[in-house]
C-alpha cells in the first residue's frame, strides 16, 4: 500500500458488509483477491469491508481479505485495486429517502451496483434495488480471515502492518450495540408465514452506521421490505 493511503492507521476498526436487499433476496458486495467484484447471497470473508469517511460525504471502501480498494473505471465498472487512486477509489455516499445508501463516483458519476448495467446517479432518481445498499455488522469469526491477530511483544511493528495492513484485526473497544429500534427480534429464516419479515435471514444483526465509530439513532437503517 502506498503511504498516502487514507486507510492506513485508520482508527475505525469495525468490519461491515454492504448488501442489496429486495423483497426476497440480498447480495453482499465482495471484493475478491484478483480484484473481481460481485455479490454473494451471504456474508463471506471477501464481503467483509472497512469503510472510511472523508470530508463532504466521500467514503473509501476496502475489502479486508483481498486488501484491495473498491474503485471504478471510466466505464462504470467496479473493481478492487491494491493501489489507491483518489480519483477512482473514492465514492460519494448518499442516503436515499427510503433509508438505503447509494455510492457513486464523483469522477464518472456512475453508481456502485451489483447489477451489470452502468447507470449514472442523478439527484432525486430511484435507482434499481441492486444499486441500493444496507449495511450489516460482520458475523464471520476473525479466525476465518486467516490473518493472525498480532500478539503483543512477539512481532515487530513492521510485521504487524504487513500481516494486517488495514489495522482491522487489532483489538479495539467494541462498537456500541445498535439501538433497540434497530435490532428487533426477527422471525426464523425458515418461517414461511406471510408475516415473516426476514424469510432469507438477510437482515440478522443490528444495522450499523457504516461511516462512524459507533451507532446512534442516525445509524439505523430500515428493515428491508421482506414479507
Amino acid at each position: 500500500y502506498p503511504n498516502a493511503s487514507p486507510l492506513l492507521g485508520s482508527s475505525w476498526g469495525g468490519l461491515i458488509h454492504l448488501y442489496t436487499a429486495t423483497a426476497r433476496n440480498s447480495y453482499h458486495l465482495q471484493i475478491h483477491k484478483n480484484g473481481h467484484v460481485d455479490g454473494a447471497p451471504h456474508q463471506t470473508i471477501y464481503s467483509a469491508l472497512m469503510i472510511r469517511s472523508e470530508d463532504a460525504g466521500f467514503v473509501v471502501i476496502t475489502g479486508v481479505m483481498s486488501r484491495r480498494y473498491l474503485c471504478m473505471d471510466f466505464r462504470g465498472n467496479i473493481f478492487g485495486s491494491h493501489y489507491f487512486d483518489p480519483e477512482n477509489c473514492r465514492f460519494q455516499h448518499q442516503t436515499l429517502e427510503n433509508g438505503y445508501d447509494v455510492y457513486h463516483s464523483p469522477q464518472y458519476h456512475f453508481l456502485v451496483s451489483l447489477g451489470r448495467a452502468k447507470r449514472a446517479f442523478l439527484p432525486g432518481m430511484n435507482p434499481p434495488p441492486y444499486s441500493q445498499f444496507l449495511s450489516r455488522r460482520n458475523e464471520i469469526p476473525l479466525i476465518h480471515f486467516n490473518t493472525p491477530i498480532p500478539r503483543r511483544h512477539t512481532q515487530s511493528a513492521e510485521d504487524d502492518s504487513e500481516r494486517d495492513p488495514l489495522n482491522v484485526l487489532k483489538p479495539r473497544a467494541r462498537m456500541t450495540p445498535a439501538p433497540a429500534s434497530c435490532s428487533q427480534e426477527l422471525p426464523s429464516a425458515e418461517d414461511n408465514s406471510p408475516m415473516a419479515s426476514d424469510p432469507l435471514g438477510v437482515v440478522r444483526g443490528g444495522r450499523v452506521n457504516t461511516h462512524a465509530g459507533g451507532t446512534g439513532p442516525e445509524g439505523c437503517r430500515p428493515f428491508a421490505k421482506f414479507i
Epitope: R24, A40, R116, Y130
Partner: antibody
Framework: QVQLVQSGAEVKKPGASVKVSCKAS????????MHWVRQAPGQGLEWMGI????????SNAQKFQGRVTMTRDTSTSTVYMELSSLRSEDTAVYYC??????????WGQGTMVTVSS | AIQLTQSPSSLSASVGDRVTITCRAS??????LVWYQQKPGKAPKLLIY???SLESGVPSRFSGSGSGTDFTLTISSLQPEDFATYYC????????FGPGTKVDIK
C-alpha cells in the same frame, strides 16, 4: 459451462406430493440464489419461490405458502422443490432458474408434472 | 405486490416488420425489468436486463427501453426465429412476470 439439469416427468394423483430436483454444474453453487417458476399448459410464467443455497432459507409466493418446500444439498449442488396436496391445476412445467442479481440467466430444461386421477 | 401488464397479448407480424411490445408496472420499479423470449417446449431465454441492457449473445435487433412504470421491447426487423412468446419480469419487489405477448406469423 453453466447447466441446470432437472429430474424427469412425473404423473401424480390429486392429494399426492411431487419432488422435483435441479442439479447445478459449471459454477459455484453457493454463490447464487435459485428460483422455482412454473408454467401451466398454454399459460404464462408464475414465480413460486427462492432458496438461499448456503443457508437453505426459503421464501415462497403467498399462493404456495404451506404447500411448497424447497431444500438443497450442497454436497451434490442440487436444489429440490416439493409440492404437496396436489390438485389438477398444479399440472404444469416446473423450472429452476439461477439468479444473477439482475435477471434469471440460466434455466433448467423443465419438468412436466401431470396431476390426474 | 407489483403487477405487470403486457400489451398486446398477441400480435401477428411478417418477417422484416418492426415489432413493439409494452410492459406496464402497477408502481415504479426504476429500471429493474427483464425481458425473456420463450419458444414452445423450451425454457425462457434472457434477452434484456435492467430495462435496456442487451444480454450477451442476443442479436442487436432486440432493444429495451423505459424506466419507472412504462417499458418497451422492440424488435427492429423481425426474423423467422423471433416468432415466440415474450415475457417481462420485474426485479424491484418479488419477481413478478407479465402475462406474455405471443408473436406469430401473419
Amino acid at each position: 459451462q453453466v447447466q441446470l439439469v432437472q429430474s424427469g416427468a412425473e404423473v401424480k394423483k390429486p392429494g399426492a406430493s411431487v419432488k422435483v430436483s435441479c442439479k447445478a454444474s459449471g459454477y459455484t453453487f453457493t454463490n447464487h440464489y435459485m428460483h422455482w417458476v412454473r408454467q401451466a399448459p398454454g399459460q404464462g410464467l408464475e414465480w413460486m419461490g427462492i432458496i438461499n443455497p448456503i443457508s437453505g432459507s426459503t421464501s415462497n409466493a403467498q399462493k404456495f405458502q404451506g404447500r411448497v418446500t424447497m431444500t438443497r444439498d450442497t454436497s451434490t449442488s442440487t436444489v429440490y422443490m416439493e409440492l404437496s396436496s396436489l390438485r389438477s391445476e398444479d399440472t404444469a412445467v416446473y423450472y429452476c432458474a439461477r439468479d444473477i442479481v439482475d435477471a434469471f440467466d440460466f434455466w433448467g430444461q423443465g419438468t412436466m408434472v401431470t396431476v390426474s386421477s | 405486490a407489483i403487477q405487470l401488464t403486457q400489451s398486446p397479448s398477441s400480435l401477428s407480424a411478417s418477417v422484416g416488420d418492426r415489432v413493439t411490445i409494452t410492459c406496464r408496472a402497477s408502481q415504479g420499479i426504476s429500471s429493474a425489468l427483464v425481458w425473456y423470449q420463450q419458444k414452445p417446449g423450451k425454457a425462457p431465454k434472457l434477452l434484456i436486463y435492467d430495462a435496456d441492457s442487451l444480454e450477451s449473445g442476443v442479436p442487436s435487433r432486440f432493444s429495451g427501453s423505459g424506466s419507472g412504470t412504462d417499458f418497451t421491447l422492440t424488435i427492429s426487423s423481425l426474423q423467422p426465429e423471433d416468432f415466440a412468446t415474450y415475457y417481462c419480469q420485474q426485479f424491484n419487489d418479488y419477481f413478478t412476470f407479465g402475462p406474455g405477448t405471443k408473436v406469430d406469423i401473419k
